[in-house]
Interface confidence: low
């Protein structure tokens, strides 16, 4: 069968900018790296049939099915999908291979099925079969991981009930504060579900799949650290597991740890202890308090006590539903053109929020930082001194929150003018909103000092561009000023700006701009 062509079938996944629909066989798109689909000869079939590996595509994804044919001479082709013939335009690549493409833009249910490509070359005829199906992402979920104790072992299992099965990793850090950020060299990652080394300073578990990445931190009270000024607070929803770790280091083993809830010792089976010697021969003890599924009555003050350290507490609050607590009243800010300034929102939320900052229909990434008092803060500094409305939006599984900000930039007015046969108008966007004067320039008043008061109509804030106010002033034309130069001036506390307009006949008007500080 040496005269059979060499066939290569590939799948190209396109970056989805979420804006394409349709399909065409006539042109490939801006693309990612191709994935080989094999294209093996199908045994026991009448005629020469090649079968590509099955293709599973996300809803709305854009793909190209492509066949590369290494055969001499010209080729002609035809795509058939659901008994419909589709146009096919082969072209040749730099290696002189025939290239046939089928673009599926924004995959929908109707575009799933068998795509048959019939190719006729000078030597032979053959068929290539692609089977395209939609990946069932409706079932996809990504849940925040939680902890369980490993049966008969002093180890924690990290569980995330997610579809598809997530990759679970432990993120460990042994230093304090800022140096425990994800990218820090102090951070160690272990891609496994079970963790035996539970003595570290900061322990998190993260789960990731196609939907993203979610992390849960092991709540820790460190008796060797100075307590926070405000009591640490842990929120959980009814039914979630509770895990609190109490950690203490002492010069020798002569100390013990205990947990109490509201001054009552925790029941056996709700705690377990581990200990180890550190490199400098000091003893580290950790005592876990855990409840496999919390109820409302598990709310209260959990206190870890030691015979050699001051005790510390945490307030555990069990809620029926998640929440986002913050003040949603809108805030207005007025700053100078070069003043450094950041918007900020302080909030308390459970579960952790996802958030965005939006300005002028553009969304910006949102970073959040935990504060010592149980609150978190999100700041936005990338406003580039553009006045207008800024929106902070946050949501979690159970709640949504939106807060509006208005930014005004103090600057002197800048005037734009336009004129028609019957009136002249001036516009300005300075802040604070400017006041207006109109002056007539004539032989009697070559410096344009003669003020016009009649026929002037001022409109404050006549249009709002993403929160940016624009003020305008209109002069209705009268016989007394026809043919003269008039000057409109806008002024505020930062300066004055003027435009001179020749009031002659309709048509393009010459404007002369004056800037007076």
């Amino acid at each position: 069968n040496q005269d059979l062509p060499v066939i290569k079938c590939v799948l190209i996944n396109h970056k989805n900018n979420d804006s394409s629909v349709g399909k065409s066989s006539s042109y490939p798109m801006v693309s990612e790296s191709p994935e080989d689909l094999g294209c093996a000869l199908r045994p026991q079939s009448s005629g020469t049939v090649y079968e590509a590996a099955a293709v599973e595509v996300d809803v709305s994804a854009s793909i190209t099915l492509q066949v590369l044919v290494d055969a001499p001479g010209n080729i002609s082709c035809l795509w058939v999908f659901k008994h419909s013939s589709l146009n096919c335009q082969p072209h040749f690549d730099l290696q002189n291979r025939g290239v046939v493409s089928m673009v599926i833009l924004k995959m929908t249910e109707t575009q799933a099925g068998e795509y048959l490509l019939f190719i006729q070359s000078e030597a032979t005829n053959y068929t290539i079969l692609f089977t395209v199906s939609i990946r069932n992402t409706l079932l996809y979920t990504l849940r925040r991981p939680y902890f369980r104790k490993m049966e008969n072992q002093d180890a924690l299992v990290c569980i995330s009930e997610s579809v598809p099965e997530p990759i679970v990793e432990w993120v460990l850090c042994d230093s304090q504060g800022e140096s425990c950020k994800e990218e820090s060299p102090a951070v160690v990652k272990k891609e496994e579900k079970v963790l035996h080394e539970l003595f570290g300073t900061d322990i998190r578990c993260c789960a990731r799949n196609e939907l993203g990445r979610e992390c849960t931190r092991l709540f820790t009270i460190d008796l060797n650290q100075t307590p926070q000024t405000t009591l640490p607070q842990l929120f959980l929803k009814v039914g979630e597991p509770l895990w609190i770790r109490c950690k203490a280091v002492h010069v020798n083993h002569g100390f013990g740890l205990t947990w109490e809830l509201e001054n009552k010792a925790l029941e056996e089976g709700n705690y377990f202890e581990m200990s180890t010697y550190s490199t400098n021969r000091t003893m580290i003890r950790i005592l876990f308090a855990f409840v496999s599924s919390v109820a409302r009555n598990d709310t209260g003050y959990y206190t870890c006590s030691s015979s050699k350290h001051p005790s510390q507490s945490a307030l555990v609050t069990i809620v029926e539903k998640g929440f986002i607590n913050a003040t949603n009243s809108s805030e207005d800010y007025e700053i100078d053109q070069y003043e450094e300034f950041c918007f900020s929102v302080r909030f308390k939320a459970y579960p952790q929020i996802r958030c965005t900052w939006t300005f002028s229909r553009k969304s910006f990434p949102c970073e959040q930082k935990g504060l010592d008092n149980g609150y978190s803060i999100s700041k936005f500094c990338n406003h580039k001194h553009q006045p207008g409305e800024y929106i902070f939006h946050a949501e979690n599984d159970d709640a949504q929150f939106t807060k509006m900000f208005t930014l005004n930039i103090r600057r002197k007015p800048q005037v734009l003018a336009e004129a028609s046969a019957s009136q002249a108008s001036c516009f300005s966007d300075g802040y604070p909103l400017p006041s207006w004067t109109w002056k007539k320039c004539s032989d009697k008043s070559p410096n344009c000092t003669e003020e016009i008061t009649e026929g002037v109509w001022n409109r404050k804030a006549n249009r709002k561009v993403f929160g940016q106010w624009v003020s305008s002033s209109t002069l209705n034309m009268s016989e007394a000023i026809k043919g003269f130069l008039v000057k409109c001036c806008a002024y505020n506390s930062l300066g004055t700006s003027c435009e001179t307009i020749l009031l002659n006949s309709p048509g393009p008007f010459p404007f002369i701009q004056d800037n007076i500080s």
Partner: antibody, heavy 120, light 107 residues
Framework: QVQLVQSGAEVKKPGASVKVSCKAS????????MHWVRQAPGQGLEWMGI????????SYAQKFQGRVTMTRDTSTSTVYMELSSLRSEDTAVYYC?????????????WGRGTLVTVSS | DIQMTQSPSSLSASVGDRVTITCRAS??????LAWYQQKPGKAPKLLIY???SLQSGVPSRFSGSGSGTDFTLTISSLQPEDFATYYC?????????FGQGTKLEIK
Amino acid sequence: QVQLVQSGAEVKKPGASVKVSCKASGYTFTNYYMHWVRQAPGQGLEWMGIINPSGGSTSYAQKFQGRVTMTRDTSTSTVYMELSSLRSEDTAVYYCARGVGYSGYGADLWGRGTLVTVSS
Amino acid sequence: DIQMTQSPSSLSASVGDRVTITCRASQGISNSLAWYQQKPGKAPKLLIYAASSLQSGVPSRFSGSGSGTDFTLTISSLQPEDFATYYCQQSHSPPYTFGQGTKLEIK
């Protein structure tokens, strides 16, 4: 700023060819398809074809097959539409228009149009 | 080729009116439909893409709906600047055909 600038008006004799250019600026030229659409005086819009500036591949409406050629020059971010064997009914304003995303959502950015007059 | 039929071909209305223009495809095109506005001597302007998504910068009085073969463009409260010709275009598969247009005139 993001814009498409087309070449100036042309007057051609029947049987001749015309080549209209469309220069893109303010965005990544190879990331968007370019459509060509024409409009005869007092008539509606007529889609002529599309070109992928990345690879240069094209798709033409059947009506123009064999008479139209769309090309591009990535070094100058310019696409060209050449129409041959002109007849009087080809008198129209020819627009280039950038495809939204790839091409499946219509066209979000249009040139001002180039008037081509075919007259003996 | 997919044929696009717009109706009505012309329409008289007053400022403040609610106006609906319909577009029918000769075969199912999912939501692959765009609406344009064109004023005399100007290039068309994209209003709606993917049948119902409002193009950035277009006033919210414009809205689109429909899927499959039947689509509508609605202007909730006509403004003086809305008097123009409106076109639908299918963007499902080449050739990306246009409807014949609907001329919206002042009553």
